[in-house]
């Protein structure tokens, strides 16, 4: 993976009392913004836990890995990283935990080499549909992004502006078909109740998808069919009750897939029979011997792989004439 390392050597630190001046002049090649640490040898700039309220204007042109974590940025405006000359080498940008609640259209424009972006642990109440595509064209220029990390970006309930959070995130992922080259997408810990059905079909290059620790109840309307290159699908710690035949067949048809299903409240009734049969045969599911029933009560903690058809019954549905009030 291309993750930036934090073991950069020979950092030079800017004197903390220097003001970060906005200047039309390009920064000096060896200049380091106030409150940041820079290593030209490692092409890395770290402005970490400094309570910055805006992106420094005087970032050195050599920066390849930029850490802006643990700040108070609040808003990323359009062209937040646009510089003259541009930050042409910036490949990995980490903005996690920086109190961002708004990312505007074109926030990441003019970063031609940006491969990896981490916005995790920010309460993104307002993520523009064009945050990643940069424009509202129906087909945008392809984004260079390959890894997009959006774990725990769900805002508090009262800040969600009366709209679907899932819908807002998906709109940003799909706008302009700009993210067709995305290989890793992490959306863990976002309280997702559902996955909009069109999202995966438009991300054909995905190799790793992390949807763990959400509240997904069903995958019935989600299609994995076109994700030929998908290698890992993390669905741990959701609210999945059962996987139905269509989903099972699609997953089995992906040549490299490994699926992680731990800690879901599996309902072990007659609807579970197909999944149990599949689990016994498949090599797709990692740690399948750890999967246990949560419901009904009589089946709690039973291992799915140890069940047979006689164990999986449904209470008969009484005809209306026999139902009591």
């Amino acid at each position: 993976s291309s993750s930036p390392t934090s073991s950069a050597s020979s950092f030079s630190s800017s004197a903390p009392f220097l003001a970060s001046a906005v200047s039309a002049q390009p920064p000096l090649p060896d200049q380091c913004p106030a409150l940041c640490e820079c290593s030209e040898a490692a092409r890395t700039v770290k402005c970490v836990n400094r309570n910055l309220t805006e992106v420094p204007t005087d970032l050195p042109a050599y920066v390849r890995n930029l850490f802006l974590t643990g700040n108070q940025l609040a808003v990323l405006p359009a062209g937040a990283f646009a510089r003259r000359p541009p930050l042409a080498e910036l490949a990995a940008l980490n903005l996690s935990g920086s109190r961002l609640d708004e990312v505007r259209a074109g926030a990441f424009e003019h970063l031609p080499s940006l491969r990896q972006l981490d916005l995790s642990h920010n309460p993104l109440a307002d993520l523009s549909p064009f945050a990643f595509s940069g424009s509202n064209a129906s087909v945008s220029a392809p984004s260079p992004l390959v890894e997009l990390i959006l774990n725990h970006i769900v805002p508090p309930e009262d800040e969600r502006q009366n709209r679907s959070f899932e819908g807002m995130v998906v709109a940003a992922l799909l706008a302009g078909r700009a993210l067709q080259g995305l290989r890793r997408l992490e959306l863990a810990s976002n309280h997702f109740l559902y996955l909009p059905r069109d999202v995966l079909a438009q991300l054909p290059s995905l190799r790793h998808l992390d949807l763990s620790n959400n509240s997904l109840v069903s995958l019935t309307y989600v299609s994995f069919r076109n994700l030929t290159h998908l290698e890992s699908l993390h669905l741990e710690d959701n609210a999945l009750k059962v996987l139905h035949n269509g989903t099972l067949a699609e997953l089995q048809g992906l040549p490299h897939i490994r699926v992680f299903l731990d800690n879901n409240p599996w309902v072990c009734d007659c609807h579970m029979a197909d999944m149990v049969t599949w689990l016994k045969e498949t090599e797709v599911v990692q740690g399948k011997d750890r999967l246990t029933c949560a419901y009904p009560e009589k089946m709690r903690n039973r291992v799915l792989l140890e069940l047979n058809s006689a164990d999986l019954d449904c209470d008969p549905i009484l005809p209306p004439s026999l139902q009591t009030s």
């Epitope: 291309s2 080499s113 491969r115 790793h208 890992s232 040549p255 490299h256």
Partner: antibody, heavy 118, light 113 residues
Framework: EVKVEESGGGLVQPGGSLRLSCAAS????????MSWVRQAPGKGLEWVSI???????YYASWAKGRFTISKDNSEGMVYLQMNSLRAEDTAVYYC????????????WGQGTTVTVSS | EIVLTQSPSSLSASVGDRVTITCQSS????????LSWYQQKPGKAPKLLIY???TLASGVPSRFSGSGSGTDFTLTISSLQPEDFATYYC?????????????FGQGTKLEIK
Amino acid sequence: EVKVEESGGGLVQPGGSLRLSCAASGFSLSSYWMSWVRQAPGKGLEWVSIIAGRGSTYYASWAKGRFTISKDNSEGMVYLQMNSLRAEDTAVYYCARVSSIYYTFNLWGQGTTVTVSS
Amino acid sequence: EIVLTQSPSSLSASVGDRVTITCQSSQSVYSNNELSWYQQKPGKAPKLLIYYASTLASGVPSRFSGSGSGTDFTLTISSLQPEDFATYYCQGSYYSGSGWYYAFGQGTKLEIK
């Protein structure tokens, strides 16, 4: 320490067989694709075969039918079984790990030498 | 059969020179940018320099750069250093309905003038 180390090379007669091993350490084989690449004396690099994290296998057209790649995730081992060996298979054989995101060989072993001669 | 052709096959240059090596693929590489460059010194394993056509691998000096897309790619060394004299290989990754295929160029030997 993350590394791969090849072994199993040696002298073999034409028509014979040999199994090369690659020991992976510091990472989980189930999460990475692994490949074999060879280099004949004084020649360039030549891709041989690759095995995906879950075990799917792919081969150079000339290697199909004679060479078989396999692995044991729990032991951290990748293997290349070579049958019906010919003089032109004489080479240094490298084991290489593939990046988890990009399709590039980002970790190489030092190679093991195979000599096919009578 | 996919073929990667590097040019030149060999070249002589001096310390401080700017050097360019090209790599042409008979088919487009996967996603138009799955092209890597490696450096190999005698008796040693290859070392990854550039991946994804233009992304510098960790620890590689910035005098190395890569460009290109689809079938035509370039490796540039902006100012040759003594340790850069070696053989350079391009490598493409390809995907079709029948699966994955990888190929290397024949190599470019960079020698001291």
